[in-house]
Each structure stands twice: as C-alpha cells, then as structure tokens.
Amino acid sequence: ELCDDDPPKITHATFKAVAYKEGTMLNCECKRGFRRIKSGSPYMLCTGNSSHSSWDNQCQCTSSAARNTTKQVTPQPEEQKERKTTEMQSQMQLADQVSLPGHCREPPPWENEATERIYHFVVGQTVYYQCVQGYRALHRGPAESVCKMTHGKTRWTQPQLICTGETEPSQFPGEEEPQASPDGLPESETSRLVTTTDFRIQTEVAATMETFIFTTEYQ
C-alpha cells in the first residue's frame, strides 16, 4: 500500500532509505532537455518473489529536441518516489553489500536522469536521517521514520533527531522538539537537491551510522 504522505522534514537533516520495500515506485524523470521515451514506463517498480527482489521496467530518457531518431538510452533498472538523490548512492555503501529480503537496493543511475529522484514509498518502509554537514545530531531515540497505516490512513513516525550547529550551544535532548508539520505529516513533498557535500560525514560517524542502520533493519 502506498504511503499517501511524505517522511517528516527535520531541520538541517536529510534522509535516505537503505533499501526499498517491494511495491516502492521510482519516477522515471529526465534532466532538462530530455524526456521519457514515449513507450517507456513512467515508473520503476520494486517487485520480487520469495527469494529475490529487483526493479521492474527501465527508465529511458531521450532528447526532447529530436524526433523519433534520437538514441534511446537504456537506463539501469530501479527507482521510486518520495525523496531522492543520485549522489546519496555513494553513501552507506553497505547497502550495496547486503540484500534485505523483500527489498530492492538503490537503482543504478540511468543516462540523462534528473538530478532529483522521486520515490513513492509503501507502508512499512523505513528511512534514516542524518544531519547535514556542519550540524551534529542530538538523539533522544532512533533517527528513523517508518510509514505506518492506521484505519486506512498512512503516516510517518517522528524521527527522534535534532540537528544543532557545531558553533551553537548544544541543547540536551528534551529541550527542543524536532521541527515537524501538523499531525506529524511532512512539510514538503520533495526536499531540496542533496549533494555529496551535504551528505558527507566524518568517517567514524559514517561507520557508526552504517552499523546502527543495519542492526536496526534486521531487528
């Protein structure tokens, strides 16, 4: 079942799914000057059987200027809709080494894809948050959000994370609530483009984060 809302927006933080639950959809978006080929699917879909999950359909972009003679780029499968960024792929490379049952890994990029990936998550999906460069995390619980469904309505749990500037006096957990929109629903559908710089973190922090993520994911 699709989550009909977005993960919460945390000030000075970005989020990422380490693996995508079956049913997740990724928009086949192309960069400016290119468009999806006419016969191409508008989405990639994470599908699977009992033993293996993979992305169905391939996103293909072709030049908007050309008629029917443009080269049809064969993208590499995989995508979704709700948040994005190709640059994030380089993060948490553990995701490429571990396969979670019933989940797809981050799809490889396809030629001329848009700078932002739009994923449509499904109920049960977990996304993980970390502070952008220059901010440090104050935790009062897991820095993650899960899409849940109650009475036919979907919602994301609130991540227990505050990102504070390195130069600011640090607050203790409990002093300040994370920024969230009313009813715990997201403030924006598509977050700004996250670059590698935004997501770059100290090596030891990265290692800790990876361990934390995979421990959590398997529990």
Epitope: E1, L2, D4, D5, D6, G23, M25, P42, Y43, L45, H120, V122, V123, M149, H151, G152, K153, T154, R155, S181, P182, D183, L185, P186, E187, S188, E189, T190
Partner: antibody, heavy 116, light 106 residues
C-alpha cells in the same frame, strides 16, 4: 467537521479551459494530499492525480497529464484543477477527495459539460 | 496499470438477500478498498484495507480476500443499500477503481 466544497457546474465550449475549485475546512489543509477523481456520465471512477498543498508537488495519472493541472492555495485552503483544450469526452463530474490514505472525505462534485 | 474487474456489473436483488460482489485485480495488491455511490452523490468510503468497516457503516457489510481476488458481501440487503459499489486499489500508481457494480431492485 471536515468539509470539501467544490465550485458550481460549468458549461464550456470545445477548445476552452475550465478551473474547478475545492475549498477545504475542518482540518489542516497542508497535512493531507488532495486527490482528484473523474466520473464521466454513466461511467466509473478514474483517478486524475493529487497535489501536496504544502509543497505544490503533483503526481498525475499519465492519461490526464496533458489535460489536467492541479494547484493549491494554502492561504485560502483551496485546491484547483484546471482542464485545458476541452473536448466533448471531458464532460464529467470531477471530485476532489482528501488523501492521506483512503479517500474518507469527498467534495460534492462539479459537473463540467463540454458542448458547442 | 492495475486493472480492476468487478462482477457482476449489475445485480438484481431483493431486500433481505445476501449479496456478493467480487473484484479481481490484474496484479497482486496489498489491500482492497470499497466505496458506495448513490445517484447524484459523491462516493462514500465503505470498507478500507480489505475488511475494515468505515465509520458508521452497518455490520451487514463485510469484505475479504487477498492477492488478486477480493469480495464485498452484504449479509441481508436493506433498502438503503441499493447503490453502485466500486472497488479501489492504492497499491501502485495510477490508483484505479473497478468499473462498478450496480445493485438494483429485483
């Protein structure tokens, strides 16, 4: 209580455009996506697309991607759907429905008739 | 796109009858949702996530199924139940509905 109130019936000429409104009250407008559903005379329901009012992000059924444009105005808690290049086959009742999962609240519907 | 096929398209029944409407999805889906619509009115949520009754819906309505086959049952048809019923999936975009089943007076 939650209410979605739509604009009145419209009669339009082929080739023209129409903009249907859906005013929400009784809940936080930006906390739920607003979906639009179409029903041609004597036919079933077809999903057109949705908007996230807080960000303006839209997702469309590919069938209506070149026909419908969904927008929202946070200041008035109103969602809009504009239909362009109208043809007789666009004659239908158009409903807005509150998202966030199943459609628990619907507008009363707006009949758009396209006739020369 | 996931196609939803309802059967029958029209069902003639009398008050007190047990009525069953089926909905087949062209691909496996997580849940089915059901709406009731009366002439000139907006659809109304009847059953969500396959088997849960929406607020205010009488217990004579029930839903079941999984995968690609789902059923809506009215255990004892009442005068207020003559309407058109639609199944709906929101497991994948585009969201789709069945073509509808009209329950009419026999």
């Amino acid at each position: 209580q939650v209410q979605l109130v739509q604009s009145g019936a419209e009669v339009k000429k082929p080739g023209s455009s129409v903009k249907v409104s859906c005013k929400a009250s009784g809940y936080t407008f930006t906390s739920y996506r607003m979906h639009w559903v179409r029903q041609a005379p004597g036919q079933g329901l077809e999903w057109v697309g949705y908007i996230n009012p807080s960000s303006g992000y839209t997702e469309y059924n590919q069938k209506f991607k070149d026909k419908a444009t969904i927008t929202a105005d946070e200041s008035t808690n109103t969602a809009y759907m504009e239909l362009s290049s109208l043809r007789s086959e666009d004659t239908a009742v158009y409903y807005c429905a509150r998202g966030g999962g199943v459609f628990d609240y619907w507008g009363q519907g707006t009949l758009v008739t396209v006739s020369s | 796109d996931i196609q939803m096929t309802q059967s029958p398209s029209t069902l003639s029944a009398s008050v007190g009858d047990r009525v069953t409407i089926t909905c087949s999805a062209s691909s496996s889906i997580s849940y089915m949702h059901w709406y009731q619509q009366k002439p000139g009115k907006a659809p109304k949520l009847l059953i969500y996530t396959t088997s849960n009754l929406a607020s205010g819906v009488p217990a004579r309505f029930s839903g079941s199924g999984s995968g690609t086959e789902f059923t809506l049952t009215i255990s004892s048809l009442q005068p207020d139940d003559f309407a058109t019923y639609y199944c709906h999936q929101r497991s994948t975009y585009p969201l789709t509905f069945g073509q509808g089943t009209k329950v009419e007076v026999k």
